[in-house]
């Protein structure tokens, strides 16, 4: 339904508070380097303009599209050329090219300082002095560091952030109350950002069909009692929501997400029995709850899939009638029966089925050709099962830190050209699959592990895309979305890699390491491990373990010493020499 003024329509639908928050997020995700105050000024100007349109939808410029209004506003930033370089060229373009240009300049790894958490008392004072500015600053800092963060979900995080300060700044022990809550929000936020980044990559790099296939599989697992037509409707609506958010249309996205939550709750009887609690919550919590809701129970006595998809003589007729609908039904039927499979596995099975039909339906006797198609699924199912079994055994044997180190070595040998910070970040996250998923029973391990790995490997792909250095990474990232993990798993040591020159500076450590948190100290050690492997890619596990053990002992010894800096200088030289000898550098 067309509105005379799109900006007035969204302002009225969302309300002033959400409108302002979403415009701030949108601007911060586009202009990631701009100071907070500049963004607040732009948001206030847009908000005042929106109010004039609410009062009179026929007022000047109120009929302009949101992209035109927001783009025009962003292009008023005085320092655009100095701060953003070629991004300023976007402003010479017309819509929709201008918005596409802004989207292409979003930076997944912006050169921004790490967010340092102030003392609790300082935070509480700032919160009490100006709650609104304090919360806006949170939105701004998260949005500029995570330019694809799911905007309506960021509103939910901000609500929880506010609640944490409201409660804890009144507590007897503020720090004990607040810090665990902030840690939880930080970790959940990073996970949420990475999950959304995969959705946007799926849409932008592989297209709507790829995203819809993912959504059919996931929603069919989650709502196995819902009919195919119902799942299809939800998939269409969900695709619209994510297409909008990934495209920077945050007001439309938030509005449509609210409509989708409303529809799901009004129709929960035909969707899932698990939605009742979610649907009693306020909007932001409701949408979050629905997105995370557990899988409903599978209907009893579901018939065998073979009847409709292998044994029926009308398989090719049904496929010809509407290929994507028939494949969608196959995916729906398979997924609702297999909550124990990862979404990416289900998509691989559907792709195998499609390839088989393409080949067999062209034959004179199709049935004879596709009769054994389900046999082709067996190795595809067993591969992730075996991989997860092996890696969970390794995780249980080593613990998270050493499991991460094993993955660091494995991935550095596969793709040694990738930057050390990226290898450390990605391998640490890959290693978290152990504590996240290995505790689950068999039936939940694969969906947990393989779908999580898809999210982490997408981080590698988007970071690598910014500065491509490895053809192997490019190949695994671009050939097939659902085969990324098997592609990386299949990579062996890169024999073409010329080892990095030895640089003693890389292995020089100082007393400041002693004051770091355990996590930061681990990252330092893991950075050294990656550098070691880059210098000596043929080093054995045993050699690397010996050097790392020596390194850990050296850090522990010097951090206990009276003159720490001298210890690091003298013992460090000995350690480098011993390591060189041990590794034959």
């Amino acid at each position: 339904d067309a509105h005379k003024s799109e900006v007035a329509h969204r302002f009225k639908d969302l309300g002033e508070e959400n409108f302002k928050a979403l415009v701030l997020i949108a601007f911060a995700q586009y202009l990631q380097q701009c100071p907070f105050e500049d963004h607040v000024k732009l948001v206030n100007e847009v908000t005042e303009f929106a109010k004039t349109c609410v009062a009179d939808e026929s007022a000047e410029n109120c009929d302009k599209s949101l992209h035109t209004l927001f783009g025009d506003k962003l292009c008023t930033v005085a320092t655009l050329r100095e701060t953003y370089g070629e991004m300023a060229d976007c402003c010479a373009k017309q819509e929709p090219e201008r918005n596409e240009c802004f989207l292409q300049h979003k930076d997944d790894n912006p050169n921004l300082p790490r967010l340092v958490r102030p003392e609790v008392d300082v935070m509480c004072t700032a919160f009490h002095d100006n709650e609104e500015t304090f919360l806006k600053k949170y939105l701004y800092e998260i949005a500029r560091r995570h330019p694809y963060f799911y905007a309506p979900e960021l509103l939910f995080f901000a609500k929880r952030y506010k609640a944490a300060f409201t409660e804890c700044c009144q507590a007897a022990d503020k720090a004990a109350c607040l810090l665990p809550k902030l840690d939880e929000l930080r970790d959940e936020g990073k996970a949420s950002s990475a999950k959304q980044r995969l959705k946007c990559a799926s849409l932008q790099k592989f297209g709507e069909r790829a995203f819809k296939a993912w959504a059919v599989a996931r929603l069919s697992q989650r709502f196995p009692k819902a009919e195919f037509a119902e799942v299809s409707k939800l998939v269409t609506d969900l695709t619209k929501v994510h297409t909008e958010c990934c495209h920077g249309d945050l007001l439309e996205c938030a509005d449509d997400r609210a409509d989708l939550a409303k529809y799901i709750c009004e129709n929960q009887d035909s969707i899932s029995s698990k939605l009742k609690e979610c649907c009693e919550k306020p909007l932001l919590e409701k949408s979050h709850c629905i997105a995370e809701v557990e899988n409903d129970e599978m209907p009893a006595d579901l018939p065998s899939l073979a009847a409709d998809f292998v044994e029926s003589k009308d398989v090719c007729k049904n496929y010809a009638e509407a290929k994507d609908v028939f494949l969608g039904m196959f995916l729906y039927e398979y997924a609702r029966r297999h909550p124990d499979y990862s979404v990416v596995l289900l998509l691989r099975l559907a792709k195998t089925y499609e390839t088989t039909l393409e080949k067999c339906c062209a034959a004179a006797d199709p049935h004879e050709c596709y009769a054994k198609v389900f046999d082709e699924f067996k190795p595809l199912v067993e591969e992730p099962q075996n991989l997860i079994k092996q890696n969970c055994e390794l995780f249980e044997q080593l613990g998270e830190y050493k499991f991460q180190n094993a993955l660091l070595v494995r991935y550095t040998k596969k793709v040694p050209q990738v930057s050390t910070p990226t290898l450390v970040e990605v391998s640490r996250n890959l290693g978290k699959v152990g504590s996240k998923c290995c505790k689950h029973p068999e039936a939940k391990r694969m969906p947990c592990a393989e779908d999580y790995l898809s999210v982490v490997l997408n981080q590698l792909c988007v970071l690598h895309e910014k500065t491509p250095v490895s053809d192997r990474v490019t190949k695994c990232c671009t050939e097939s979305l659902v085969n990324r993990r098997p592609c990386f798993s299949a990579l062996e040591v890169d024999e073409t890699y010329v080892p990095k020159e030895f640089n003693a500076e890389t292995f020089t450590f100082h007393a400041d390491i002693c004051t770091l948190s355990e996590k930061e100290r681990q990252i330092k050690k893991q950075t050294a491990l990656v550098e070691l492997v880059k210098h000596k890619p043929k080093a054995t596990k045993e050699q690397l373990k010996a050097v790392m053990d020596d390194f850990a002992a050296f850090v522990e010894k010097c951090c206990k010493a009276d003159d720490k800096e001298t210890c690091f200088a003298e013992e460090g030289k000995k350690l480098v020499a011993a390591s060189q000898a041990a590794l034959g550098l």
């Epitope: 090719c316 010809a320 339906c361 062209a362 004179a364 049935h367």
Partner: nanobody, 114 residues
Framework: AVQLVESGGGLVQPGGSLRLTCTAS????????MSWVRQAPGKDQEWVSA????????NYADSVKGRFTISRDNAKKMLYLEMNSLKPEDTAVYYC???????SSPGTQVTVSS
């Protein structure tokens, strides 16, 4: 939507000939194997002949081997059945189908009688 329309049937004397045509629309005809099936009054449906998408493979029921010839023109989206030396037992409604599926078109009546 998939549409298959058969034509070319009629009344013919034993030993005579007919050429059936099936005009296809609503799907990528060139990607699918096609068949002719027939149904005589009071009898089960019988598969007659099949052809692969690229015409490289042609199969026939024993009852029509040497008398019937299946062919196709992918550019025109047409399937053909050339029927020679027709016998009274060839009397039936003839349908063209995708793969070896069940008929969903009206078919064309072939009657062989003196």
């Amino acid at each position: 939507a998939v549409q298959l329309v058969e034509s070319g049937g009629g009344l013919v004397q034993p030993g005579g000939s007919l050429r059936l045509t099936c005009t296809a629309s609503g799907f990528t005809f060139r990607s699918f194997g096609m068949s002719w099936v027939r149904q005589a009054p009071g009898k089960d449906q019988e598969w007659v002949s099949a052809i692969s998408a690229d015409s490289s493979t042609k199969n026939y029921a024993d009852s029509v081997k040497g008398r019937f010839t299946i062919s196709r023109d992918n550019a025109k989206k047409m399937l053909y059945l050339e029927m020679n030396s027709l016998k009274p037992e060839d009397t039936a409604v003839y349908y063209c189908v995708i793969g070896r599926g069940s008929p969903s078109s009206p078919g064309t009546q072939v009657t062989v009688s003196s």
